[in-house]
């Protein structure tokens, strides 16, 4: 139950992220803002009127729309949190859970190529479930997550381009790949 | 005026299953977290279950994967299925509506679970 | 789970008395601290929430004070309906857990 109206939100290693809550507008009947951690079932920030905001550490904020900001994301953020709204009566006036999953940046891709036998390959090093596309002169040729090797027969002259890419970045690369008629690398 | 009215208690074997139930009244129910809390026979309190006014439970490790914590807002009633249970869940089932910080602002008469052979 | 406890566990007052319990956070919650009083056959009921604030048709006798990790509820001038026993309980994180209890008696 959880998990299946939660809302999917992507972050990125090392980045800031805000949380903001959706259809959500603070107003003098608000009186109290909790966001938790479920997986520990911890409260980590809090705003309550004419209180002094609650945060249970510095990586986090909590702005007066009720939005909450993670800084310097790291893999053990990656969890489901849960802020609840309440009016001045205890009323939970407003609840949202966030699924908030982490990946890591992809790397720019490097292409690399021989002509001995017009095999060229795409790699991408860094990155969380990255996909990788190759193009040849702007044609879809290969998908593929982290090398693509591919070997090229229509003509020795052509600009390949290779994409990296996953839910919180995208990353490419082209390279104009001429191979003389008998050639050696 | 609020009223919370508990159901479903009784003596039960050890290993054995017990429904309770809350039936919830005088407030817009689907509105508001609950919880059911447990009165040892020492006069201990323990909080047992917690669910929020849009179905997110939270259960302590004494009877998480035993205990399911569920609501009905349409029948404005509240149900705790209990299982595998132990002597140690001997006690007194009160629910309770809480307000925004686990105050237990208004509480039921109570459902009396005894788990003996 | 944030231990509570209270003290004392008994005790005994005269009716006029202004009485003092005491509770005990193991770690620090703020003013997140709320008080009960269960009187003999019944349920719970709330007296006062974060620590300080009253509760509407709590007599005015009852008040509570403190922060962090140490809190008091205070009966001003105890009278005899009074008797029962007075639970504290953390309402900073989950499980929300609460004291041992106070046992107030009338001499």
């Known amino acids: 139950k959880e998990i299946t109206n939660a809302l999917e939100t992507w972050g990125a290693l090392g980045q800031d992220i805000n949380l903001d809550i959706p259809s959500f507008q603070m107003s003098d009947d608000i009186d109290d803002i909790k966001w938790e951690k479920t997986s520990d079932k911890k409260k980590i920030a809090q705003f309550r009127k004419e209180k002094e905001t609650f945060k249970e550490k510095d990586t986090y904020k909590l702005f007066k729309n009720g939005t909450l900001k993670i800084k310097h994301l790291k893999t053990d953020d990656q969890d489901i949190y849960k802020v609840s709204i309440y009016d001045t009566k205890g009323k939970n006036v407003l609840e949202k859970i966030f699924d908030l999953k982490i990946q890591e940046r992809v790397s720019k891709p490097k292409i690399s190529w021989t002509c001995i036998n017009t095999t060229l390959t795409c790699e991408v090093m860094n990155g969380t479930d990255p996909e990788l596309n190759l193009y040849q002169d702007g044609k879809h040729l290969k998908l593929s997550q982290r090398v693509i090797t591919h070997k090229w027969t229509t003509s020795l002259s052509a600009k390949f381009k290779c994409t990296a890419g996953n839910k919180v970045s995208k990353e490419s690369s082209v390279e104009p790949v001429s191979c003389p008629e008998k050639g050696l690398d | 005026e609020v009223q919370l009215v508990e159901s479903g208690g009784g003596l039960v074997m050890p290993g054995g299953s017990l429904k309770l139930s809350c039936a919830a009244s005088?407030?817009?129910?689907?509105?508001?977290?609950m919880s059911w809390v447990r009165q040892t026979p020492e006069k201990r309190l323990e909080w047992v279950a917690y669910?929020?006014?849009?179905?997110?439970?939270y259960y302590p490790d004494t009877v998480k994967g035993r205990f399911t914590l569920s609501r009905d807002n349409a029948k404005n009633t509240l149900y705790l299925q209990m299982s595998s249970l132990k002597s140690e869940d001997t006690a007194m089932y009160y629910c309770?509506?809480?307000?925004?910080?686990?105050?237990?602002?208004?509480w039921g008469q109570g459902t009396l679970v005894t788990v003996s052979a | 789970d944030i231990v509570m406890t209270q003290s004392p566990a008994t005790l005994s007052v005269t009716p006029g008395d202004r009485v003092f319990l005491s509770c005990r956070a193991s770690?620090?919650?703020?003013?997140?601290l709320h008080w009960y009083q269960q009187k003999s056959h019944e349920s719970p009921r709330l007296l006062i929430k974060?620590?300080?604030q009253s509760i509407s048709g709590i007599p005015s006798r009852f008040s509570g004070s403190g922060s962090g990790s140490d809190f008091t509820l205070s009966i001003n001038s105890v009278e005899p309906e009074d008797v029962g026993v007075y639970f504290c309980?953390?309402?900073?994180?989950?499980?929300?857990?609460f004291g041992g209890g106070t046992k107030l008696e009338i001499k």
């Open positions: 974060y620590a300080s």
């Open positions: 669910i929020s006014g849009g179905g997110f439970t």
């Open positions: 005088g407030f817009a129910f689907s509105s508001y977290d």
């Open positions: 770690q620090s919650i703020s003013d997140f």
């Open positions: 309980q953390n309402g900073h994180n989950f499980p929300p857990t």
């Open positions: 309770a509506r809480q307000g925004a910080n686990w105050e237990l602002v208004y």
